[in-house]
């Protein structure tokens, strides 16, 4: 019924310890780097580095930063307003159906087909047909890896609708 | 469709402790708080406290804390409630219930398991 | 802790005809957002409780029409528009503006 999410689907409706700082609500709402207190009275600042918001919002927590795995490398830390983004690492790309995990880049193009897109952190290299010029939608090899229950991608909870 | 199974009737002695299980399918588990009520014979309802799946936090009523303790096993969709130092009061229907991770929409329990019969008894 | 009083504790109704429950807190449940986290519930015999109404009026999913809610401050009312047979059981009003969440004791809804 529900996918994991980020603070976008979340928007815009977020423990407090006693250092964390502390503002009232605007129309019941918190700023980002914030969540609201259990008694909605206040707002408490995310752990930087540990959780963030993104959006105005009424959650009772902060959201977990994502933690980058091995075969990613970390383009932005996370802050109390921002998720970590992460990237896979040269010669790997991550697949819209398989976000979970950065596969390995094919090296070369089946024959009769020539290279038209280079390997990207988001895209295989790209194959098109020498005479045609249609693209290749052949299945990629498979890449010995093990898939982990990563803590990030993203690090947030379920969708909230129900 | 949302359902929260609870486990079945306990006999227990004074200053024993209790372990109730309700799990829950229908749902993203980590989504939402999982909230524990308990309704003793002829009494009404009392809220004790709620579990936050997604990253562990509990809130627990006052007049429960120390005394109860909230846990959940993710891999099972399973949230428990421990109430220890058993006393015949503690006699009661318990109940858990979902509630939204939000402030507006999170005081209330769209979903309650069946509820489990605790006695306490010598 | 806030007190919730239900009035009256038991009420023979009659099929077809309109009912009322009444429920007062200790406290104003106006929340300084301006909100009021006044709530309804309904168990049935040898059931649990099951959500009608949130935040005062605000029907929940599946809830019949005749079931509706009003009230501000401290006083609250659930009415059923035309009781029917399966409407029976203890109505529970709650609170969740102020921590801890209450409840009122129930007030017991029977077929004359």
């Known amino acids: 019924e529900s996918a994991l999410i980020t603070q976008q689907d979340l928007a815009p409706q977020q423990r407090a310890a006693p250092q964390q700082k502390r503002s009232s609500p605007s129309e019941g709402l918190c700023p980002p780097g914030h969540h609201i207190s259990e008694d909605g009275r206040d707002c408490i600042s995310c752990k930087y580095g540990q959780d963030y918001s993104t959006h105005w919002n009424d959650l009772l927590f902060c959201l977990r930063c994502t933690r980058c795995d091995s075969g990613e490398v970390e383009l932005s830390p996370c802050t109390t307003t921002r998720n970590t983004v992460c990237q896979c690492e040269e010669g790997t790309f991550r697949e819209e159906d398989s976000p979970e995990m950065c596969r390995k880049c094919r090296t070369g193009c089946p024959r009769g087909m020539v290279k038209v897109g280079d390997c990207t952190p988001w895209s295989d290299i790209e194959c098109v047909h020498k005479e045609s010029g249609t693209k290749h939608s052949g299945e990629v090899p498979a890449v010995e890896e093990t898939v982990t229950s990563s803590p990030g991608t993203p690090a947030s909870p379920c969708s909230l609708s129900g | 469709q949302v359902q929260l199974v609870q486990s079945g009737a306990e006999v227990k002695k004074p200053g024993a402790s209790v372990k109730v299980s309700c799990k829950a399918s229908?749902?993203?588990?980590?989504?939402?708080?999982m909230n524990w009520m308990r309704q003793a014979p002829g009494m009404g309802l009392e809220w004790m406290g709620r579990?936050?799946?997604?990253?562990?936090?509990?809130f627990y009523n006052q007049k429960f804390k120390g005394r109860v303790t909230l846990t959940v096993d993710k891999s099972t969709s399973t949230a428990y409630m421990e109430l220890s130092s058993l006393r015949s009061e503690d006699t009661a229907v318990y109940f858990c219930?979902?509630?939204?991770?939000?402030?507006?929409?999170?005081?209330?329990?769209?979903?309650w398991g069946q509820g489990t019969l605790v006695t306490v008894s010598s | 802790d806030i007190v919730m009083t239900q009035s009256p504790l038991s009420l023979p109704v009659t099929p077809g005809e309109p009912a009322s429950i009444s429920c007062r807190s200790s406290?104003?449940?106006?929340?300084?957002?301006?909100?009021?986290?006044l709530h309804w519930y309904l168990q049935k015999p040898g059931q649990s409780p099951q959500l009608l109404i949130y935040?005062?009026?605000n029907r929940f999913s599946g809830v019949p029409d005749r079931f509706s809610g009003s009230g501000s401050g401290t006083d609250f009312t659930l009415k059923i528009s035309r009781v029917e047979a399966e409407d029976v059981g203890v109505y529970y009003c709650?609170?969740?503006?102020?921590?801890?969440?209450?409840f009122g004791p129930g007030t017991k809804v029977e077929i004359k």
């Open positions: 219930g979902r509630s939204a991770y939000y402030f507006d929409s999170g005081g209330y329990f769209d979903y």
């Open positions: 229908g749902y993203s588990f980590i989504g939402y708080f």
């Open positions: 579990f936050n799946p997604y990253n562990g936090d509990t």
């Open positions: 406290q104003s449940l106006v929340h300084s957002n301006g909100n009021t986290y």
């Open positions: 935040k005062v009026s």
């Open positions: 709650s609170q969740s503006t102020h921590v801890p969440w209450t």
